[in-house]
């Protein structure tokens, strides 16, 4: 059984501030590309995804994330801290679609999380988030 | 109801966990009357990068 | 790599039932869906349903409602389809098609269903 | 239900060959839509995923594409692996369904 998944819940939702993920000559490459595919290992930060016109998911680019110093870190410098965060949307049904960005349910859903961030963390110090997956409750 | 995961990225030192979480379940009463998501079972943790795909997803329960 | 190995075949008679198993292999976790799908000789693909693993969650296609039951072990990452009251028109090949970001993006190897008197 | 109407059923074509395999869509379905390629021993592998992705480790001779309802599958330069049938299949409401298959034969 072969096949490989889609960028599915590698979204970043941005507000224009900008830091650098600095890497080693040894990297692969940086970690926020943006996969064209992805199994299960939804480890990069990439762009908000939108239906367009052309029939396909777009991922519009992200900004470098930036920091003034330089670590020794072999993926990332200092400079960026992540948190995991879940949490239950009580009046919201799951269903099969959203395990599927393509859909419109994912996306809408995906987009009003993304909007609801921004308006939380305003504040400068917030970059993105990423890896959004759903399930059942 | 739908379970959301997601992680959050912010410039080191201008945030912890408590504030995360703090700030979080501040908005839920807005979310609920902006965007019609009524929220609950807030839970908030560090993500030590680079973070696997295992350590995310192997928070839920 | 992740495979789904399907169980073996299988020849049942009129009126019983048959538990078809897909095991999940390689790099994965216990956290997506699968779709079953069947193919009846010289017919389209059907789609069956659908199972979050781990959760008792799950989607009918209205024509097997009743007949299907999906169901899932966590810790043995593997899903089942039951399919009751079997009749001559069942026999088909199954499949069992996992999420990993979206939908039906790897296949198991099919699993053929005789129902014969 | 959305019904998949998918042309032709089978094709005859040679090696090197430019095939074009069309679904058309009962009702709108956006970009869900995914290709499926059934060897001739049953074995099922996704091809394309939300009309025009391509799955890895899938070769770039096989593309998708849309035009308002009707979905193309392309395979520029037809190989002797790419001997077998084409399945469209639609995931934007349930029951997700399939098209009728595409045999692609040796000519």
């Known amino acids: 059984a072969s096949g490989s998944a889609s960028g599915s819940a590698s979204t970043l939702v941005h507000n224009g501030t900008s830091a650098r993920a600095t890497t080693t000559p040894a990297s692969k490459s940086t970690p926020f590309s943006i996969p064209s595919h992805h199994s299960d290992t939804p480890t990069t930060l990439a762009s908000h995804s939108t239906k367009t016109d052309a029939s396909s998911t777009h991922h519009s680019s992200v900004p470098p994330l930036t920091s003034s110093n330089h670590s020794t870190s072999p993926q990332l410098s200092t400079g960026v801290s992540f948190f995991f965060l879940s949490f239950h949307i009580s009046n919201l049904q799951f269903n099969s679609s959203l395990e599927d960005p393509s859909t419109d349910y994912y996306q809408e859903l995906q987009r009003d999380i993304s909007e609801m961030f921004l308006q939380i963390y305003k504040q400068g110090g917030f970059l993105g988030l990423s890896n959004i997956k759903f399930r059942p409750g | 109801s739908v379970v959301v995961q997601l992680t959050l990225a912010f410039r080191e030192g201008t945030i912890n966990v408590h504030d995360v979480e703090t700030q979080f379940n501040q908005y839920k009463t807005e979310a609920a009357s902006r965007y019609n998501l009524t929220i609950s079972d807030v839970s908030v943790s560090d993500v030590p990068f680079p973070f696997s795909a295992q350590s995310h997803h192997h928070h839920h329960h | 790599e992740v495979q789904l190995v399907q169980s073996g075949a299988e020849v049942k008679k009129p009126g019983a039932s048959v538990k078809v198993s897909c095991k999940a292999s390689g790099y994965t976790f216990t956290s997506y869906g699968i779709n079953w799908v069947r193919q009846a000789p010289g017919q389209r693909l059907e789609w069956m349903g659908y199972i979050y693993l781990g959760s008792d969650y799950t989607e009918y296609n209205e024509k097997f409602k009743g007949r299907v039951t999906l169901t899932s072990d966590t810790s043995a990452s593997t899903a089942y389809m039951e399919l009751s009251s079997l009749r001559s028109e069942d026999t088909a090949v199954y499949y069992c098609a996992r999420s990993a970001g979206s939908l039906f993006a790897y296949w198991g190897q099919g699993t053929l269903v005789t129902v014969s008197s | 239900d959305i019904q998949l109407t998918q042309s032709p059923s089978s094709l005859s074509a040679s090696v090197g060959d430019r095939v074009t395999i069309t679904c058309r869509a009962s009702?709108?379905?956006?970009?869900?839509l995914n290709w499926l390629q059934q060897e001739p021993g049953g074995a099922i592998k996704r091809l394309i995923y939300a009309t025009s992705s391509l799955d890895s480790g899938v070769p770039k001779r096989f593309s998708g594409s849309r035009s308002g309802s009707d979905y193309t599958l392309t395979i520029s330069s037809l190989q002797p692996e790419d001997f077998a049938t084409y399945y469209c299949l639609q995931y934007a409401s349930s029951p997700y369904t399939f098209g009728g298959g595409t045999k692609v034969e040796i000519k």
């Open positions: 009702q709108d379905i956006g970009i869900t």
